[in-house]
Interface confidence: low
């Protein structure tokens, strides 16, 4: 189809080479009140057809996306040629950053409902470039966490180094829907609920003497509980002695509760104390046996093929640790009598 009648929008994606990030394009087809754009010719009120294109329907989910090859070849259907680009309703998701994403993307309705729809399309010229070292070193991340129940904020990564006063007007979207009230480079959330989780997009306009571009960034927001202030506690073993039968196999379980931490590096291990010697035991991998929003219970077992006299003289120590501190619980084996 002829794309000369498509409206044009220029977008800039400056990606950080330090982190994974995604990008989206919205198919910003004209709203019903702007529907003259969708006509091949301007119509006088008497000529307006019974069904104006898009009139009365805000559901523009049934759209087709194409990429325009730079060499002038025919338009390519995005779904067939680009596995790292995914279409969902009227949004195009770029899953991996890279300058090779630069180019012209065209969207139009999949169903042409009348001859007046022909020119109803949008051409988006996307320029993708890596962030230069000169850019702000401490720009906001493309993955941001909000603490449930507290006050929080979502920062636009491409503007996070600017003060609110300097910042241009920002357009925010959440999960593809326009957040019409938000215009600053930061969304302040008075009280965080789990529904604040989602994909946020922030746009602002950057102009030079020649043209103007929409600078866009995508932020994945996750709602979490606060980092624990406690070291892990050992739930099992509780007793420091354990009655055993000599010559029989034995499994001692160590279960520990670790509070939530954003950066979670739990340690749970067994070691043996034998008079002056102390060594870590190679035991089966630890496994998570219960996970909630607030904490996680991790278990690790020590397995003795058969209990010997020597084991009765040893201490079996479970050691657990998180970023706050560590806890230990030792177990002494005692021969069962009778």
């Amino acid at each position: 189809f002829n794309i000369s009648g498509c409206s044009t929008k220029k977008l800039l994606w400056t990606y950080s080479t330090r982190s994974e990030e995604e990008f989206v394009l919205f198919c910003d087809l004209p709203e019903p009140q702007k529907s003259h754009f969708c006509h091949r010719n301007r119509l006088s009120p008497k000529q307006v057809p019974e069904h104006l294109p898009f009139m009365g329907s805000n559901d523009l989910s049934d759209v087709q996306w194409y990429q325009q090859p730079s060499n002038g070849d025919p338009l390519e259907d995005i779904r067939k040629s680009y596995p790292h680009i995914i279409q969902d309703k009227c949004t195009l998701h770029f899953l991996t950053p890279g300058v090779n994403n630069s180019g012209s993307y065209i969207c139009r309705p999949k169903m042409i409902k009348s001859p007046y729809d022909v020119a109803c399309c949008v051409k988006m010229i996307l320029e993708v470039k890596p962030q230069t070292n000169a850019s702000c070193e401490y720009s906001a991340s493309h993955k941001q966490d909000l603490l449930l129940g507290s006050t929080g904020s979502i920062s636009c990564p491409s503007l996070s180094c600017q003060s609110d006063a300097q910042s241009p007007a920002v357009t925010w979207y959440k999960n593809g829907k326009l957040l019409s009230v938000e215009r600053s480079n930061r969304i302040v959330v008075d009280e965080v609920y789990d529904y604040h989780q989602g994909t946020y997009v922030c746009d602002y306009t950057q102009s030079d003497t020649v043209s103007s571009w929409t600078v866009r960034a995508v932020v994945q927001v996750r709602t979490i509980v606060g980092d624990t202030k406690l070291k892990p506690d050992i739930l099992d073993p509780v007793e420091d002695t354990l009655e055993v039968e000599l010559g029989k196999p034995l499994t001692i379980s160590c279960k520990a509760r670790f509070g939530f931490e954003r950066v979670f590096n739990p340690v749970i291990k067994w070691y043996i104390k034998d008079s002056d010697l102390e060594w870590e035991v190679s035991v089966p991998e630890a496994k998570s046996i219960k996970s909630t929003l607030k904490d996680e219970i991790i278990e690790r077992n020590i397995i003795l093929e058969k209990v010997t006299q020597r084991d009765l003289r040893r201490k079996f120590v479970c050691f657990v640790q998180n970023s706050i501190g560590n806890t230990t619980q030792s177990v002494q084996l005692k021969e069962k009598r009778g």
């Epitope: 969902d88 949004t91 789990d194 529904y195 994909t199 994945q220 996750r222 709602t223 046996i289 929003l293």
Partner: antibody, heavy 117, light 110 residues
Framework: SVEESGGRLVTPGTPLTLTCTVS????????MSWVRQAPGKGLEWIGI?????DTYYTSWAKGRFSISKTSTTVDLKVASPTTEDTATYFC???????????????WGPGTLVTVSS | DVVMTQTPASASAAVGGAVTIKCRAS??????LAWYQQKPGQPPKLLIY???SLASGVPSRFKGSGSGTEFTLTISDLECDDAATYYC????????????FGGGTAVVVK
């Protein structure tokens, strides 16, 4: 959206991988689960992979099934299918909902696996 | 693993009437229970979560109640479109209990 693929007729013991392809949301935020339904029978939970790639399985599925993911797909590997594994396999997004619970909010249409010699 | 037992296996009522489906958990799962509706050839659809909270877009004719081990789904003012199989699911987040479904209840609307 969520869509399963890979369902086919296999002979017992032939390893099988089902793939769930998602679009419109990020697997780094949501938990995804696999559920199956034998012809004319009820729903059976297999397991779940969280946003952080932790996996949890129902007891009968441990060792027989394994769930893994990439940025846009969630795989279910059936190590050694038996005729009892004949079923429609569903992939579902399990959202964290108000009240601290999880539930299957977005489901794929399912993919049929037939295990027969 | 927790076991979810649903009763009855099937139920029928006239249009405008009501049906009650019960679900029992083999151990205390607090309010961590969801209800789904499934029609032939379709995936399940979430109706209720947290035992009594209505999922988005679900009519208020569907009502969930209960906690601990006993749960109930009541469908009032039955419509023909309510003919389906209904499942309860334990959503307690624990490696040994998460996910178990009830056996299902087929609802026939006369």
């Amino acid at each position: 959206s969520v869509e399963e693929s890979g369902g086919r007729l296999v002979t017992p013991g032939t390893p099988l991988t089902l793939t769930c392809t998602v679009s419109g949301f990020s697997l780094s935020v949501y938990a995804m689960s696999w559920v199956r339904q034998a012809p004319g029978k009820g729903l059976e939970w297999i397991g779940i992979i969280t946003w952080s790639a932790d996996t949890y399985y129902t007891s009968w599925a441990k060792g027989r099934f394994s769930i893994s993911k990439t940025s846009t797909t969630v795989d279910l590997k059936v190590a050694s299918p038996t005729t009892e594994d004949t079923a429609t396999y569903f992939c579902a997004r399990f959202d964290y909902l108000v009240g601290g619970t999880w539930a299957g909010v977005l489901w794929g249409p399912g993919t049929l696996v037939t295990v027969s010699s | 693993d927790v076991v979810m037992t649903q009763t009855p296996a099937s139920a029928s009522a006239a249009v405008g009437g009501a049906v009650t489906i019960k679900c029992r958990a083999s151990e205390d799962i607090e309010s961590y229970l969801a209800w789904y509706q499934q029609k032939p050839g379709q995936p399940p659809k979430l109706l209720i979560y947290s035992a009594s909270s209505l999922a988005s877009g679900v009519p208020s004719r569907f009502k969930g109640s209960g906690s601990g081990t006993e749960f109930t789904l009541t469908i009032s003012d039955l419509e023909c479109d309510d003919a389906a199989t209904y499942y309860c699911q334990c959503t307690y987040w624990d490696s040994s209990t998460v996910g178990a479904f009830g056996g299902g209840t087929a609802v026939v609307v006369k």
